[in-house]
Interface confidence: low
């Protein structure tokens, strides 16, 4: 592993990204550590404010974590010749608040992208598709990791955060080859209706630690390759028949449902019946009721129809709360 020793004398290599001269074979950007044997460049916790322009052409794994990049402009990684081998790009925790359209263009081998732990006030609809065409060239991305990218409330745009992320995921149908999508810890209240339909190759979907209340308008039907669906730590109250049937119809799926505030009333009967016979839910014996109070901590699998009642609806004159 070689450490960087270049200084400002390397300025000729810091011309505009697209026109920069090819880096020397053994060059390592300042504030980075490079290993040609591992095809890895790490520029980690160095408070970088922009992506180094003089990245070595051999780079396959690029870590730019723990920096202060703020903005990723269009062509942030465009080089001449291109970084044709770059397969895994980790930008987590780099204080990004804006990712513009075409930020990842000219990375023909990019399989894995991690933007986690960046407060993305603005994610362009064309961040991953690279163009505003209705059908774009397919992105090479196989794994997209977007955990905890929700900005603080005071930095949010007027439009919904869920909608902004969804627009980037579906634009140009570019992510049809995506196998893994992680969207944990984003305060999502809902999942926009059309997103999953545009991601037919998904094998792993992580929506854990959000605030999803219902999956009623979400369709999993076309996710025939889905192997893992993580819905732990949300605000789910019950799964209805349509959702249950869709999940049961997926040939390989494992669903994770721990730590949701299940409401064990008459509306839960179908889900309990399904849980007792399905092999789809991992750790289903751990699922417990949160409401109503009299049912708290009861194990869903131990319930029968007699346990699952709904209070009669009182006329308005008798309602006290």
């Amino acid at each position: 592993t070689s450490s960087a020793s270049s200084s400002s004398s390397s300025a000729p290599f810091l011309a505009s990204a697209a026109s920069a001269q090819p880096p020397l074979p053994d060059q390592c950007p300042a504030l980075c550590e490079c290993s040609e044997a591992a095809r890895t460049v790490k520029c980690v916790n160095r408070n970088l404010t922009e992506v180094p322009t003089d990245l070595p052409l051999y780079v396959r794994n690029l870590f730019l974590t723990g920096n202060q990049l703020a903005v990723l402009p269009a062509g942030a990684f465009a080089r001449r010749p291109p970084l044709a081998e770059l397969a895994a790009l980790n930008l987590s925790g780099s204080r990004l608040d804006e990712v513009r359209g075409g930020a990842f263009e000219h990375l023909p081998s990019l399989r894995q992208l991690d933007l986690s732990h960046n407060p993305l006030a603005y994610l362009s609809p064309f961040a991953f598709s690279g163009s505003n065409a209705s059908i774009s060239a397919p992105s090479p991305l196989v794994e997209l990791i977007l955990n905890h990218i929700v900005p603080p409330d005071d930095k949010r745009q007027n439009r919904s955060f869920e909608g902004m992320v969804a627009a980037a995921l579906v634009a140009g149908r570019a992510l049809q080859g995506l196998h893994l999508l992680e969207l944990a810890s984003n305060h999502f209240l809902y999942l926009p209706r059309d997103v999953l339909a545009q991601l037919p190759s998904l094998r792993y979907l992580d929506l854990s630690n959000n605030s999803l209340v219902s999956l009623t308008y979400v369709s999993f039907r076309n996710l025939t390759h889905l192997e893992s669906l993580h819905l732990e730590d949300n605000a789910l109250k019950v799964l209805h028949n349509g959702t249950l049937a869709e999940l049961q119809g997926l040939p390989h799926v494992r669903v994770f449902l721990d730590n949701n505030p299940w409401v064990c009333d008459c509306h839960m009967a179908d889900m309990v019946t399904w849980l007792k016979q399905t092999g789809v839910v991992q750790g289903k014996d751990r699922l417990t009721c949160a409401f109503p109070e009299k049912m708290r901590n009861r194990v869903l699998l131990e319930l029968n129809s007699a346990d699952l009642d709904c209070d009669p609806i009182l006329p308005p004159s008798l309602q006290t709360s």
């Epitope: 081998e85 894995q112 991690d114 990791i145 196998h179 992680e182 944990a184």
Partner: antibody, heavy 120, light 111 residues
Framework: DVQLVESGGGLVQPGGSRKLSCTAS????????MHWVRQAPETGLEWVAY????????YYADSVKGRFTISRDNPKNTLFLQMTSLRSEDTAMYFC?????????????WGQGTTLTVSS | DIVLTQSPASLAVSLGQRATISCRAS??????????MHWYQQKPGQPPKLLIK???NLESGVPARFSGSGSGTDFTLNIHPVEEEDTATYYC?????????FGGGTKLEIK
């Protein structure tokens, strides 16, 4: 059904060469990275080499670097391991295996293996 | 290179009981969101078979009595309840970096 069938093993003298083949069927070979893994008699598993789906990336274990070359012929659904300067410690069962994605997943299908014996 | 140390080297478990196998890595093989550790089963005369990928994800077709857990440097494979057909050698393997390495193996015998 996914199938991987290795061939080319046998008895080789120290210093000699051998080329192993692995023929794939039942899946789109050109979409998968491929590995060679070996297992010496009565011992554990040792990863040997990897080649990416489009042959742009190669990795080797230090123990074989400079002596072994991994390659593939996607139209023919075949993976190769060219071995030169063979040593007695290269004696092992050689398995080919596929990996579905860069990095994250395990080796999800393996062939039955072919035995290489390096001895005079 | 990352060294994977499995323990115990062998164990004998009564039918229907729990078998627990540990794997310790010489450095972390987990990112903030994922673990690059996998478990395999190998029976005599057969190739290894993937059981668990990425620490805890059961491979399609593998019985639910197999489960995996752990992150960072410490990982565990559990089999419960153990069945006769689980007699085999079990290996952990990381894919954090090149070279991939395997643990030394744990031989499981059913009493």
């Amino acid at each position: 059904d996914v199938q991987l069938v290795e061939s080319g093993g046998g008895l080789v003298q120290p210093g000699g060469s051998r080329k192993l083949s692995c023929t794939a069927s039942g899946f789109t070979f050109s979409n998968f990275g491929m590995h060679w893994v070996r297992q010496a008699p009565e011992t554990g598993l040792e990863w040997v080499a990897y080649i990416s789906s489009g042959s742009s990336t190669f990795y080797y274990a230090d123990s074989v670097k400079g002596r072994f070359t991994i390659s593939r012929d996607n139209p023919k659904n075949t993976l190769f391991l060219q071995m030169t300067s063979l040593r007695s410690e290269d004696t092992a069962m050689y398995f080919c295996a596929r990996s579905p994605a860069y990095y994250r997943y395990g080796l999800d299908y393996w062939g039955q293996g072919t035995t290489l014996t390096v001895s005079s | 290179d990352i060294v994977l140390t499995q323990s115990p080297a062998s164990l004998a478990v009564s039918l229907g009981q729990r078998a627990t196998i540990s794997c310790r890595a010489s450095q972390s093989v987990s990112s903030s969101t994922f673990s690059y550790m996998h478990w395999y089963q190998q029976k005599p005369g057969q190739p290894p078979k993937l059981l668990i990928k990425s620490s805890s994800n059961l491979e399609s077709g593998v019985p639910a009595r197999f489960s995996g857990s752990g992150s960072g440097t410490d990982f565990t494979l559990n089999i419960h309840p153990v069945e006769e057909e689980d007699t085999a050698t079990y290996y952990c393997q990381h894919s954090w970096e090149i070279p991939y390495t395997f643990g030394g193996g744990t031989k499981l015998e059913i009493k």
